[in-house]
Interface confidence: low
């Protein structure tokens, strides 16, 4: 005969654990039902009655099966430099990520706490490493034979055009100017752009039972603005 299914609340066998989506209530000393995501425990269980769950109120949520007496508050509204990539619902927190042209200078478990504008390399400097969702642009001086005449977070140093007859030699911030006869070869017919980082929703993972890889270690104090690196501009 199949074993009888116990209905909550029930006393667990010594040494055994409660089943999935149940928790052990020490006061009742019974296995009781957890509340589903989007709900919270309105009344805790007793020896004879199971947990009473209720829906989360507006602007609050529970993401996991739980027995919390109050739902968690959704995070504050996204700032002007952010995009809301996940709305606050009864089952999930709001997630804010950085808008295009910005990167996440201070991340949190999900989304971004502090966005900063991507560095722009000034003329004479090109992008050595493009910005990503979580890292700033790195600029480098244009090497001999290359130039950048833009203030940009995407343009790299481009080779000078090669002239039959040079009217004005190129430098780090200006292309060579040829005499009226056309150049023999152009190394760079147009500006070379690096792909702009696109802020996408960070992949959500369920919190593990040890979130200290999250809360206890992942929160950092926001740092003040750092001085612009050489070859960069705050524009």
């Amino acid at each position: 005969l199949p074993a009888q299914v116990a209905f909550t609340p029930y006393a667990p066998e010594p040494g055994s654990t409660c089943r999935l989506r149940e928790y052990y209530d020490q006061t009742a000393q019974m296995c009781c039902s957890k509340c589903s995501p989007g709900q919270h425990a309105k009344v805790f269980c007793t020896k004879t009655s199971d947990t009473v769950c209720d829906s989360c109120e507006d602007s609050t949520y529970t993401q996991l099966w739980n027995w919390v007496p109050e739902c968690l508050s959704c995070g504050s509204r996204c700032s002007s430099d952010q995009v809301e990539t996940q709305a606050c619902t009864r089952e999930q927190n709001r997630i804010c990520t950085c808008r295009p042209g910005w990167y996440c200078a201070l991340s949190k478990q999900e989304g971004c706490r502090l966005c900063a504008p991507l560095r722009k390399c000034r003329p004479g400097f090109g992008v050595a490493r493009p910005g990503t969702e979580t890292s700033d642009v790195v600029c480098k001086p244009c090497a001999p034979g290359t130039f950048s005449n833009t203030t940009s977070s995407t343009d790299i140093c481009r080779p000078h055009q090669i002239c039959n007859v040079v009217a004005i030699p190129g430098n780090a911030s200006m292309d060579a100017v040829c005499t009226s006869t056309s150049p023999t070869r152009s190394m760079a017919p147009g500006a070379v752009h690096l792909p702009q980082p696109v802020s996408t929703r960070s992949q959500h993972t369920q919190p593990t039972p040890e979130p200290s890889t999250a809360p206890s270690t992942s929160f950092l104090l926001p740092m003040g603005p750092s001085p612009p690196a050489e070859g960069s501009t705050g524009d």
């Epitope: 409660c18 425990a41 027995w67 109050e70 039972p209 979130p211 809360p215």
Partner: antibody, heavy 123, light 112 residues
Framework: EVQLVESGGGLVQPGGSLRLSCAAS?????????MCWVRQAPGKGLEWVGC?????????YYANWAKGRFTISRDNSKNTLYLQMNSLRAEDTAVYYC??????????????WGQGTLVTVSS | DIQMTQSPSSLSASVGDRVTITCQAS??????LSWYQQKPGKAPKRLIY???TLASGVPSRFSGSGSGTDFTLTISSLQPEDFATYYC??????????????FGGGTKVEIK
């Protein structure tokens, strides 16, 4: 840096009152964390005082010995936790620790402690 | 409130020894038990929660076991930095705080 800093400790006479503060920094002191006080008398073990749920108005839970004399409150706008202690006795002399506890079912129990503030009750 | 009884209250051991500390709850606390390490003048540090889950950054020589009322903390090979006082704590999270987060009396591990 993520930290809790207690203040307000000192010497107080028996029967007197004292309010301890705990300033939280480096993390969001909203209703995702619920905060507790633990004390430790000189040379003795740890003793749980009580906890407050994340919402400003409670609820609060206390050790039986603390009920009636000790009150825990919080000001989320100031990222600060308080412990109001009344009718103090010599046996309340201890280092008082502020402790952060995760409020949901993630197992993040008592994972962040302040450095403690010493309260001495003596005439 | 739940009472937590820890034993021994102190023990002497040498580096490399296997050390076992026990903790007994006055009623069943399922697996809602944490262990802490405290060094003189410092705040406690969490080692283990849910009776057997190692907290982040804690060396694997620490382990916990037990369920219900009887729990054990084991240090498989004692290191010089492990000489400290250890506390157990009944800690069932959300609704457990209706009846307390009692600590055990502590076990002081001293150099033999």
């Amino acid at each position: 840096e993520v930290q809790l800093v207690e203040s307000g400790g000192g010497l107080v006479q028996p029967g007197g009152s004292l309010r301890l503060s705990c300033a939280a920094s480096g993390f969001s002191f909203t209703n995702n964390y619920y905060m507790c006080w633990v004390r430790q008398a000189p040379g003795k073990g740890l003793e749980w005082v009580g906890c407050i749920y994340p919402s400003i108005v409670g609820p609060t839970y206390y050790a039986n010995w603390a009920k009636g004399r000790f009150t825990i409150s919080r000001d989320n706008s100031k990222n600060t936790l308080y412990l109001q202690m009344n009718s103090l006795r010599a046996e309340d002399t201890a280092v008082y620790y502020c402790v952060r506890d995760r409020y949901d079912d993630y197992g993040d129990y008592f994972n962040l402690w302040g450095q403690g503030t010493l309260v001495t009750v003596s005439s | 409130d739940i009472q937590m009884t820890q034993s021994p209250s102190s023990l002497s051991a040498s580096v490399g020894d296997r050390v076992t500390i026990t903790c007994q709850a006055s009623q069943s606390i399922y697996n809602y038990l944490s262990w802490y390490q405290q060094k003189p003048g410092k705040a406690p540090k969490r080692l283990i929660y849910y009776a057997s889950t190692l907290a982040s950054g804690v060396p694997s020589r620490f382990s916990g076991s037990g369920s219900g009322t009887d729990f054990t903390l084991t240090i498989s090979s004692l290191q010089p930095e492990d000489f400290a006082t250890y506390y157990c704590q009944s800690n069932s999270g959300v609704n457990g705080n209706r009846y307390g987060n009692a600590f055990g009396g502590g076990t002081k591990v001293e150099i033999k």
